[in-house]
Amino acid sequence: MAVTACQGLGFVVSLIGIAGIIAATCMDQWSTQDLYNNPVTAVFNYQGLWRSCVRESSGFTECRGYFTLLGLPAMLQAVRALMIVGIVLGAIGLLVSIFALKCIRIGSMEDSAKANMTLTSGIMFIVSGLCAIAGVSVFANMLVTNFWMSTANMYTGMGGMVQTVQTRYTFGAALFVGWVAGGLTLIGGVMMCIACRGLAPEETNYKAVSYHASGHSVAYKPGGFKASTGFGSNTKNKKIYDGGARTEDEVQSYPSKHDYV
Protein backbone atom coordinates (compact mmCIF):
# COMPACT_ATOMS: atom_id res chain seq x y z
CA MET A 1 0.00 0.00 0.00
CA ALA A 2 2.88 2.38 0.78
CA VAL A 3 4.27 1.85 -2.71
CA THR A 4 0.87 2.54 -4.31
CA ALA A 5 0.53 5.73 -2.26
CA CYS A 6 4.07 6.83 -3.13
CA GLN A 7 3.47 6.14 -6.81
CA GLY A 8 0.08 7.88 -6.81
CA LEU A 9 1.42 10.90 -4.95
CA GLY A 10 4.43 11.07 -7.27
CA PHE A 11 2.08 11.07 -10.25
CA VAL A 12 -0.14 13.83 -8.80
CA VAL A 13 2.85 16.01 -7.79
CA SER A 14 4.39 15.57 -11.25
CA LEU A 15 1.07 16.35 -12.92
CA ILE A 16 0.80 19.62 -10.97
CA GLY A 17 4.45 20.38 -11.75
CA ILE A 18 4.08 19.82 -15.50
CA ALA A 19 0.89 21.90 -15.57
CA GLY A 20 2.93 24.62 -13.88
CA ILE A 21 5.77 24.31 -16.40
CA ILE A 22 3.26 24.65 -19.26
CA ALA A 23 1.67 27.67 -17.53
CA ALA A 24 5.05 29.32 -16.95
CA THR A 25 6.11 28.76 -20.56
CA CYS A 26 2.91 30.40 -21.83
CA MET A 27 2.94 33.31 -19.36
CA ASP A 28 3.85 36.81 -20.53
CA GLN A 29 5.40 37.92 -17.25
CA TRP A 30 8.87 36.42 -17.39
CA SER A 31 10.35 39.84 -16.92
CA THR A 32 8.53 42.92 -15.66
CA GLN A 33 9.48 46.57 -15.64
CA ASP A 34 11.36 47.49 -12.49
CA LEU A 35 9.40 50.19 -10.68
CA TYR A 36 11.81 50.72 -7.80
CA ASN A 37 13.88 53.92 -7.88
CA ASN A 38 12.49 54.79 -11.33
CA PRO A 39 10.49 57.82 -12.44
CA VAL A 40 6.80 56.89 -12.22
CA THR A 41 5.57 56.10 -15.72
CA ALA A 42 1.98 55.68 -16.87
CA VAL A 43 3.09 52.67 -18.93
CA PHE A 44 4.09 49.23 -17.62
CA ASN A 45 6.19 46.86 -19.73
CA TYR A 46 6.50 43.11 -19.32
CA GLN A 47 7.91 40.33 -21.48
CA GLY A 48 7.47 36.62 -21.98
CA LEU A 49 9.21 33.95 -24.06
CA TRP A 50 6.90 34.49 -27.01
CA ARG A 51 5.79 38.14 -26.89
CA SER A 52 6.25 41.45 -25.11
CA CYS A 53 3.39 43.49 -23.67
CA VAL A 54 2.70 47.08 -22.70
CA ARG A 55 -0.06 48.02 -20.27
CA GLU A 56 -1.05 51.67 -20.17
CA SER A 57 -2.47 53.18 -16.98
CA SER A 58 -5.76 53.54 -18.85
CA GLY A 59 -5.96 49.74 -18.81
CA PHE A 60 -5.21 49.29 -22.51
CA THR A 61 -2.84 46.37 -23.04
CA GLU A 62 -1.02 45.66 -26.28
CA CYS A 63 1.08 42.57 -26.90
CA ARG A 64 3.42 41.93 -29.79
CA GLY A 65 4.77 38.52 -30.72
CA TYR A 66 8.43 37.96 -31.52
CA PHE A 67 7.86 37.29 -35.22
CA THR A 68 11.49 36.49 -35.86
CA LEU A 69 13.54 33.44 -35.07
CA LEU A 70 17.01 34.50 -36.15
CA GLY A 71 16.82 37.97 -34.61
CA LEU A 72 16.21 36.72 -31.07
CA PRO A 73 18.99 36.36 -28.48
CA ALA A 74 20.54 32.89 -28.33
CA MET A 75 19.85 32.74 -24.59
CA LEU A 76 16.12 33.28 -25.17
CA GLN A 77 16.12 30.53 -27.78
CA ALA A 78 17.92 28.25 -25.31
CA VAL A 79 15.34 28.98 -22.59
CA ARG A 80 12.50 28.26 -25.03
CA ALA A 81 14.17 24.97 -26.00
CA LEU A 82 14.70 23.91 -22.38
CA MET A 83 11.08 24.66 -21.46
CA ILE A 84 9.71 22.82 -24.52
CA VAL A 85 11.95 19.80 -23.87
CA GLY A 86 10.75 19.87 -20.25
CA ILE A 87 7.10 19.93 -21.35
CA VAL A 88 7.56 17.14 -23.96
CA LEU A 89 9.45 14.87 -21.54
CA GLY A 90 6.91 15.60 -18.81
CA ALA A 91 3.98 14.84 -21.10
CA ILE A 92 5.52 11.54 -22.21
CA GLY A 93 6.33 10.77 -18.57
CA LEU A 94 2.71 11.38 -17.59
CA LEU A 95 1.47 9.11 -20.37
CA VAL A 96 3.85 6.32 -19.33
CA SER A 97 3.10 6.74 -15.63
CA ILE A 98 -0.67 6.45 -16.17
CA PHE A 99 -0.14 2.88 -17.46
CA ALA A 100 2.41 2.23 -14.71
CA LEU A 101 0.02 3.11 -11.88
CA LYS A 102 -0.54 0.09 -9.66
CA CYS A 103 -4.18 0.98 -9.14
CA ILE A 104 -4.87 0.72 -12.87
CA ARG A 105 -5.20 -2.78 -14.30
CA ILE A 106 -4.26 -3.21 -17.96
CA GLY A 107 -4.65 -6.77 -19.18
CA SER A 108 -2.21 -9.12 -17.50
CA MET A 109 0.66 -6.62 -17.19
CA GLU A 110 3.40 -7.95 -14.96
CA ASP A 111 4.63 -6.02 -11.93
CA SER A 112 8.08 -5.99 -13.49
CA ALA A 113 6.72 -4.13 -16.53
CA LYS A 114 4.93 -1.63 -14.26
CA ALA A 115 8.13 -1.17 -12.28
CA ASN A 116 10.11 -0.43 -15.45
CA MET A 117 7.47 2.01 -16.63
CA THR A 118 7.41 3.72 -13.23
CA LEU A 119 11.19 4.10 -13.31
CA THR A 120 11.09 5.41 -16.90
CA SER A 121 8.43 8.01 -16.04
CA GLY A 122 10.31 8.94 -12.86
CA ILE A 123 13.51 9.62 -14.80
CA MET A 124 11.52 11.59 -17.38
CA PHE A 125 9.96 13.73 -14.63
CA ILE A 126 13.36 14.36 -13.06
CA VAL A 127 14.85 15.46 -16.40
CA SER A 128 11.72 17.52 -17.15
CA GLY A 129 11.97 19.30 -13.81
CA LEU A 130 15.68 19.94 -14.29
CA CYS A 131 15.03 21.37 -17.77
CA ALA A 132 12.43 23.78 -16.37
CA ILE A 133 14.64 24.84 -13.46
CA ALA A 134 17.59 25.28 -15.82
CA GLY A 135 15.51 27.30 -18.30
CA VAL A 136 14.13 29.62 -15.64
CA SER A 137 17.55 30.02 -14.01
CA VAL A 138 19.22 30.89 -17.33
CA PHE A 139 16.55 33.55 -17.94
CA ALA A 140 16.92 34.88 -14.39
CA ASN A 141 20.69 35.11 -14.82
CA MET A 142 20.17 36.97 -18.10
CA LEU A 143 17.86 39.43 -16.30
CA VAL A 144 20.32 40.04 -13.46
CA THR A 145 23.15 40.71 -15.93
CA ASN A 146 21.01 43.12 -17.99
CA PHE A 147 19.66 44.80 -14.84
CA TRP A 148 23.09 45.76 -13.57
CA MET A 149 24.24 46.77 -17.04
CA SER A 150 21.23 49.07 -17.48
CA THR A 151 21.69 50.43 -13.93
CA ALA A 152 25.28 51.35 -14.79
CA ASN A 153 24.09 53.09 -17.98
CA MET A 154 21.01 54.62 -16.42
CA TYR A 155 22.30 58.00 -15.40
CA THR A 156 24.74 58.70 -18.18
CA GLY A 157 23.82 61.92 -19.92
CA MET A 158 25.41 65.00 -21.40
CA GLY A 159 26.08 67.62 -18.73
CA GLY A 160 24.06 65.68 -16.18
CA MET A 161 20.85 66.05 -18.20
CA VAL A 162 19.23 62.65 -18.60
CA GLN A 163 17.65 62.27 -22.03
CA THR A 164 16.50 58.67 -21.80
CA VAL A 165 15.68 56.71 -18.69
CA GLN A 166 16.43 53.12 -19.62
CA THR A 167 13.70 50.61 -18.82
CA ARG A 168 15.06 48.04 -16.39
CA TYR A 169 13.46 44.61 -16.04
CA THR A 170 13.21 42.43 -12.99
CA PHE A 171 11.89 38.93 -12.19
CA GLY A 172 8.34 38.30 -13.34
CA ALA A 173 5.75 35.93 -11.86
CA ALA A 174 6.51 33.26 -14.49
CA LEU A 175 10.00 32.72 -13.07
CA PHE A 176 8.62 31.80 -9.65
CA VAL A 177 5.92 29.62 -11.21
CA GLY A 178 8.64 27.90 -13.26
CA TRP A 179 10.95 27.30 -10.30
CA VAL A 180 8.16 25.87 -8.13
CA ALA A 181 6.75 23.78 -11.00
CA GLY A 182 10.18 22.44 -11.91
CA GLY A 183 10.80 21.55 -8.26
CA LEU A 184 7.45 19.75 -7.99
CA THR A 185 8.11 17.77 -11.18
CA LEU A 186 11.54 16.82 -9.83
CA ILE A 187 10.08 15.71 -6.48
CA GLY A 188 7.36 13.76 -8.30
CA GLY A 189 10.01 12.03 -10.39
CA VAL A 190 12.03 11.07 -7.32
CA MET A 191 8.86 9.66 -5.71
CA MET A 192 8.19 7.58 -8.82
CA CYS A 193 11.74 6.18 -8.71
CA ILE A 194 11.31 5.31 -5.02
CA ALA A 195 7.98 3.61 -5.81
CA CYS A 196 9.69 1.62 -8.57
CA ARG A 197 12.00 -0.04 -6.04
CA GLY A 198 9.01 -1.36 -4.13
CA LEU A 199 7.27 -2.54 -7.29
CA ALA A 200 10.18 -4.53 -8.71
CA PRO A 201 9.84 -8.30 -8.15
CA GLU A 202 12.87 -9.85 -6.49
CA GLU A 203 14.65 -12.17 -8.93
CA THR A 204 16.66 -14.04 -6.27
CA ASN A 205 14.34 -17.07 -5.97
CA TYR A 206 16.28 -20.27 -5.28
CA LYS A 207 15.70 -23.18 -7.64
CA ALA A 208 14.73 -26.50 -6.05
CA VAL A 209 17.81 -28.65 -5.48
CA SER A 210 17.73 -32.49 -5.21
CA TYR A 211 19.93 -34.10 -2.57
CA HIS A 212 20.50 -37.75 -3.28
CA ALA A 213 21.20 -39.83 -0.20
CA SER A 214 23.33 -42.84 -0.95
CA GLY A 215 21.22 -45.93 -1.48
CA HIS A 216 17.92 -44.01 -1.33
CA SER A 217 15.86 -42.42 -4.01
CA VAL A 218 14.23 -39.78 -1.85
CA ALA A 219 14.52 -36.19 -2.95
CA TYR A 220 14.70 -33.46 -0.31
CA LYS A 221 13.55 -29.97 -1.25
CA PRO A 222 14.42 -27.07 1.04
CA GLY A 223 10.98 -25.74 1.90
CA GLY A 224 11.26 -25.35 5.65
CA PHE A 225 12.72 -21.85 5.38
CA LYS A 226 9.90 -20.59 3.18
CA ALA A 227 7.97 -18.83 5.92
CA SER A 228 10.95 -17.12 7.50
CA THR A 229 12.97 -16.20 4.43
CA GLY A 230 10.24 -15.37 2.02
CA PHE A 231 11.86 -17.48 -0.70
CA GLY A 232 10.21 -20.47 -2.23
CA SER A 233 8.77 -21.86 -5.39
CA ASN A 234 6.08 -19.15 -5.57
CA THR A 235 7.44 -17.14 -8.50
CA LYS A 236 4.47 -14.75 -8.42
CA ASN A 237 6.19 -13.23 -5.37
CA LYS A 238 2.97 -11.84 -3.88
CA LYS A 239 3.70 -8.87 -1.64
CA ILE A 240 2.42 -8.67 1.91
CA TYR A 241 1.62 -4.89 1.50
CA ASP A 242 -0.52 -5.59 -1.56
CA GLY A 243 -3.36 -6.91 0.53
CA GLY A 244 -5.98 -4.96 2.45
CA ALA A 245 -8.20 -1.99 1.62
CA ARG A 246 -6.95 0.43 -1.02
CA THR A 247 -6.49 4.07 0.00
CA GLU A 248 -5.32 5.56 -3.29
CA ASP A 249 -8.18 8.04 -3.43
CA GLU A 250 -7.29 9.96 -0.29
CA VAL A 251 -8.43 13.56 -0.57
CA GLN A 252 -5.60 16.06 -0.87
CA SER A 253 -6.24 19.66 0.11
CA TYR A 254 -4.21 22.62 -1.06
CA PRO A 255 -4.18 26.10 0.49
CA SER A 256 -6.30 28.56 -1.46
CA LYS A 257 -4.49 31.41 -3.19
CA HIS A 258 -5.28 34.92 -2.04
CA ASP A 259 -3.96 37.87 -3.98
CA TYR A 260 -3.70 41.06 -2.02
CA VAL A 261 -2.99 43.84 -4.50
Partner: antibody, heavy 119, light 113 residues
Framework: QVQLVQSGAEVKKPGSSVKVSCKAS????????IEWLRQRPGQGLEWMGE????????KYNVKFKDRVTITADESTSTAYMELSSLRSEDTAVYYC????????????WGQGTLVTVSS | DIVMTQSPSSLTVSLGEKATISCKSS????????????LTWYQQKPGQPPKRLIY???TRESGVPDRFSGSGSGTDFTLTISSLQAEDLAVYYC?????????FGQGTKVEIK
Protein backbone atom coordinates in the same frame (compact mmCIF):
# COMPACT_ATOMS: atom_id res chain seq x y z
CA GLN B 1 -22.83 59.85 -26.02
CA VAL B 2 -20.11 60.42 -23.42
CA GLN B 3 -20.76 63.48 -21.29
CA LEU B 4 -18.98 65.04 -18.32
CA VAL B 5 -21.08 67.74 -16.65
CA GLN B 6 -19.42 69.95 -14.04
CA SER B 7 -20.90 72.06 -11.25
CA GLY B 8 -21.33 75.82 -11.62
CA ALA B 9 -18.95 78.73 -11.04
CA GLU B 10 -17.87 79.52 -7.49
CA VAL B 11 -16.53 82.61 -5.71
CA LYS B 12 -14.49 81.84 -2.60
CA LYS B 13 -12.60 83.71 0.10
CA PRO B 14 -8.86 83.09 0.63
CA GLY B 15 -8.24 80.27 3.13
CA SER B 16 -11.56 78.54 2.41
CA SER B 17 -12.22 75.35 0.41
CA VAL B 18 -14.03 74.59 -2.84
CA LYS B 19 -15.54 71.29 -4.00
CA VAL B 20 -16.16 70.86 -7.72
CA SER B 21 -18.26 67.97 -9.00
CA CYS B 22 -18.16 66.12 -12.31
CA LYS B 23 -21.06 63.84 -13.32
CA ALA B 24 -20.24 61.26 -15.97
CA SER B 25 -22.75 59.61 -18.30
CA UNK B 26 -22.98 57.77 -21.61
CA UNK B 27 -20.43 55.05 -20.89
CA UNK B 28 -19.62 52.25 -18.46
CA UNK B 29 -17.88 54.20 -15.75
CA UNK B 30 -15.89 51.48 -14.03
CA UNK B 31 -12.38 51.02 -15.34
CA UNK B 32 -11.95 54.61 -16.52
CA UNK B 33 -9.81 57.27 -14.87
CA ILE B 34 -11.33 60.69 -14.24
CA GLU B 35 -8.70 63.43 -14.39
CA TRP B 36 -8.69 66.85 -12.76
CA LEU B 37 -6.85 69.76 -14.39
CA ARG B 38 -6.85 73.48 -14.05
CA GLN B 39 -6.11 76.45 -16.29
CA ARG B 40 -5.26 79.79 -14.77
CA PRO B 41 -6.27 82.92 -16.74
CA GLY B 42 -4.10 83.22 -19.83
CA GLN B 43 -1.95 80.25 -18.73
CA GLY B 44 -1.39 76.65 -19.74
CA LEU B 45 -2.95 73.49 -18.33
CA GLU B 46 -1.90 71.86 -15.04
CA TRP B 47 -2.69 68.26 -14.15
CA MET B 48 -3.87 67.91 -10.53
CA GLY B 49 -4.68 64.24 -10.11
CA GLU B 50 -6.86 61.31 -11.12
CA UNK B 51 -9.21 58.69 -9.70
CA UNK B 52 -10.00 55.26 -11.13
CA UNK B 53 -13.74 54.70 -10.95
CA UNK B 54 -14.61 51.27 -9.63
CA UNK B 55 -11.42 50.79 -7.66
CA UNK B 56 -10.93 54.08 -5.83
CA UNK B 57 -7.27 54.20 -6.82
CA UNK B 58 -6.06 57.82 -6.76
CA LYS B 59 -2.94 59.59 -7.99
CA TYR B 60 -2.10 63.19 -7.11
CA ASN B 61 0.30 65.72 -8.51
CA VAL B 62 2.77 66.25 -5.65
CA LYS B 63 2.39 70.01 -6.18
CA PHE B 64 -1.24 69.80 -5.01
CA LYS B 65 -1.11 66.72 -2.77
CA ASP B 66 -1.40 68.55 0.55
CA ARG B 67 -4.36 70.65 -0.56
CA VAL B 68 -6.33 68.57 -3.03
CA THR B 69 -8.67 65.65 -2.29
CA ILE B 70 -10.21 63.62 -5.09
CA THR B 71 -13.19 61.38 -4.35
CA ALA B 72 -15.97 59.62 -6.25
CA ASP B 73 -19.52 58.49 -5.57
CA GLU B 74 -20.14 55.54 -7.85
CA SER B 75 -23.85 55.39 -7.06
CA THR B 76 -24.31 58.78 -8.73
CA SER B 77 -21.41 58.41 -11.23
CA THR B 78 -19.90 61.59 -9.87
CA ALA B 79 -16.27 62.52 -9.17
CA TYR B 80 -15.30 65.34 -6.83
CA MET B 81 -12.25 67.52 -6.43
CA GLU B 82 -11.82 69.54 -3.26
CA LEU B 83 -9.13 72.20 -3.01
CA SER B 84 -8.44 73.64 0.44
CA SER B 85 -6.51 76.66 1.77
CA LEU B 86 -7.44 78.69 -1.29
CA ARG B 87 -5.21 81.53 -2.42
CA SER B 88 -5.76 84.20 -5.07
CA GLU B 89 -3.47 82.26 -7.44
CA ASP B 90 -5.96 79.35 -7.33
CA THR B 91 -8.33 81.44 -9.44
CA ALA B 92 -8.71 79.25 -12.51
CA VAL B 93 -11.02 77.18 -14.66
CA TYR B 94 -11.07 73.64 -13.24
CA TYR B 95 -11.69 70.80 -15.70
CA CYS B 96 -12.53 67.15 -15.28
CA UNK B 97 -11.67 64.82 -18.16
CA UNK B 98 -11.85 61.12 -18.94
CA UNK B 99 -8.64 59.26 -19.70
CA UNK B 100 -9.20 57.38 -22.97
CA UNK B 101 -8.45 53.70 -23.36
CA UNK B 102 -5.52 54.40 -25.66
CA UNK B 103 -2.57 56.71 -25.27
CA UNK B 104 -3.05 57.66 -21.61
CA UNK B 105 -4.49 61.00 -22.72
CA UNK B 106 -7.86 62.66 -22.23
CA UNK B 107 -10.55 62.07 -24.83
CA UNK B 108 -13.60 63.71 -23.22
CA TRP B 109 -13.66 66.89 -21.14
CA GLY B 110 -16.15 68.63 -18.89
CA GLN B 111 -17.19 72.18 -19.74
CA GLY B 112 -15.04 73.62 -16.94
CA THR B 113 -15.83 75.32 -13.62
CA LEU B 114 -14.55 78.82 -12.94
CA VAL B 115 -13.38 79.23 -9.35
CA THR B 116 -12.61 82.80 -8.33
CA VAL B 117 -10.69 83.38 -5.10
CA SER B 118 -11.14 86.93 -3.92
CA SER B 119 -11.36 88.73 -0.60
CA ASP C 1 8.74 66.92 -13.51
CA ILE C 2 9.07 66.67 -17.28
CA VAL C 3 9.34 70.08 -18.91
CA MET C 4 7.50 70.52 -22.21
CA THR C 5 8.72 73.39 -24.35
CA GLN C 6 6.61 74.58 -27.28
CA SER C 7 7.70 76.92 -30.05
CA PRO C 8 6.71 79.35 -31.30
CA SER C 9 4.43 80.82 -28.63
CA SER C 10 2.30 82.35 -31.38
CA LEU C 11 2.04 81.73 -35.11
CA THR C 12 0.37 83.79 -37.83
CA VAL C 13 -0.40 81.89 -41.02
CA SER C 14 -2.45 82.67 -44.13
CA LEU C 15 -5.49 80.53 -44.93
CA GLY C 16 -4.53 77.48 -46.97
CA GLU C 17 -0.89 77.71 -45.84
CA LYS C 18 1.00 75.16 -43.74
CA ALA C 19 1.43 75.70 -40.00
CA THR C 20 4.09 73.86 -38.00
CA ILE C 21 4.31 73.75 -34.21
CA SER C 22 7.27 72.23 -32.37
CA CYS C 23 7.34 70.57 -28.95
CA LYS C 24 10.40 69.36 -27.01
CA SER C 25 10.39 67.29 -23.83
CA SER C 26 13.15 67.26 -21.19
CA UNK C 27 13.16 63.44 -21.24
CA UNK C 28 12.37 60.89 -23.88
CA UNK C 29 8.69 59.95 -24.09
CA UNK C 30 9.49 56.85 -26.14
CA UNK C 31 8.51 53.56 -24.55
CA UNK C 32 10.92 50.78 -25.51
CA UNK C 33 8.25 48.09 -25.05
CA UNK C 34 6.08 49.17 -27.97
CA UNK C 35 8.23 51.83 -29.64
CA UNK C 36 5.49 54.42 -29.12
CA UNK C 37 6.03 57.98 -27.95
CA UNK C 38 3.51 59.07 -25.35
CA LEU C 39 2.82 62.59 -26.53
CA THR C 40 -0.62 64.10 -27.17
CA TRP C 41 -1.67 67.24 -29.04
CA TYR C 42 -4.77 69.22 -27.98
CA GLN C 43 -6.63 72.07 -29.62
CA GLN C 44 -8.37 74.66 -27.42
CA LYS C 45 -10.70 77.19 -28.93
CA PRO C 46 -11.67 80.32 -26.94
CA GLY C 47 -14.16 79.58 -24.15
CA GLN C 48 -14.03 75.80 -24.74
CA PRO C 49 -12.29 72.86 -23.08
CA PRO C 50 -9.33 71.30 -24.93
CA LYS C 51 -10.01 68.69 -27.62
CA ARG C 52 -7.68 65.76 -28.29
CA LEU C 53 -6.30 65.81 -31.84
CA ILE C 54 -3.42 63.35 -31.83
CA TYR C 55 -2.11 60.74 -29.38
CA UNK C 56 0.91 58.41 -29.44
CA UNK C 57 2.66 61.34 -31.22
CA UNK C 58 1.14 60.48 -34.61
CA THR C 59 -2.21 58.69 -34.21
CA ARG C 60 -5.08 60.94 -35.26
CA GLU C 61 -8.22 60.95 -33.13
CA SER C 62 -11.33 59.74 -34.99
CA GLY C 63 -13.23 62.64 -36.49
CA VAL C 64 -10.17 64.90 -36.69
CA PRO C 65 -9.55 66.24 -40.23
CA ASP C 66 -6.57 64.69 -42.01
CA ARG C 67 -4.93 68.10 -42.47
CA PHE C 68 -3.72 67.61 -38.89
CA SER C 69 -0.72 65.33 -38.55
CA GLY C 70 1.76 64.57 -35.81
CA SER C 71 5.33 63.37 -36.11
CA GLY C 72 8.45 62.87 -34.06
CA SER C 73 9.77 60.45 -31.48
CA GLY C 74 11.67 60.53 -28.21
CA THR C 75 12.08 64.19 -27.28
CA ASP C 76 11.24 66.14 -30.47
CA PHE C 77 7.71 66.38 -31.84
CA THR C 78 5.85 68.37 -34.48
CA LEU C 79 2.21 69.15 -35.15
CA THR C 80 1.52 70.11 -38.76
CA ILE C 81 -1.64 71.70 -40.16
CA SER C 82 -1.18 71.14 -43.91
CA SER C 83 -3.73 73.71 -45.08
CA LEU C 84 -4.93 76.13 -42.43
CA GLN C 85 -8.68 76.72 -42.22
CA ALA C 86 -10.55 79.52 -40.41
CA GLU C 87 -11.86 77.06 -37.82
CA ASP C 88 -8.29 76.11 -36.85
CA LEU C 89 -7.87 79.40 -35.00
CA ALA C 90 -7.01 78.10 -31.50
CA VAL C 91 -4.30 77.46 -28.94
CA TYR C 92 -2.48 74.14 -29.39
CA TYR C 93 -0.94 72.24 -26.47
CA CYS C 94 1.38 69.26 -26.34
CA UNK C 95 1.20 66.93 -23.34
CA UNK C 96 3.55 64.38 -21.81
CA UNK C 97 1.42 61.37 -20.95
CA UNK C 98 4.30 59.01 -20.20
CA UNK C 99 5.60 60.27 -16.87
CA UNK C 100 3.63 61.29 -13.80
CA UNK C 101 2.76 64.05 -13.19
CA UNK C 102 1.40 64.64 -16.69
CA UNK C 103 2.69 67.98 -17.95
CA PHE C 104 1.72 70.35 -20.76
CA GLY C 105 3.54 72.77 -22.99
CA GLN C 106 2.79 76.48 -22.51
CA GLY C 107 0.72 76.50 -25.71
CA THR C 108 1.02 77.91 -29.24
CA LYS C 109 -1.58 80.42 -30.40
CA VAL C 110 -2.40 80.04 -34.09
CA GLU C 111 -3.76 83.18 -35.72
CA ILE C 112 -4.87 83.90 -39.25
CA LYS C 113 -2.99 86.48 -41.29
Amino acid sequence: QVQLVQSGAEVKKPGSSVKVSCKASGYTLTGYWIEWLRQRPGQGLEWMGEILLGSGSIKYNVKFKDRVTITADESTSTAYMELSSLRSEDTAVYYCARKGLRGNSFDYWGQGTLVTVSS
Amino acid sequence: DIVMTQSPSSLTVSLGEKATISCKSSQSLLNSGNQKSYLTWYQQKPGQPPKRLIYWASTRESGVPDRFSGSGSGTDFTLTISSLQAEDLAVYYCQNDYYYPFTFGQGTKVEIK
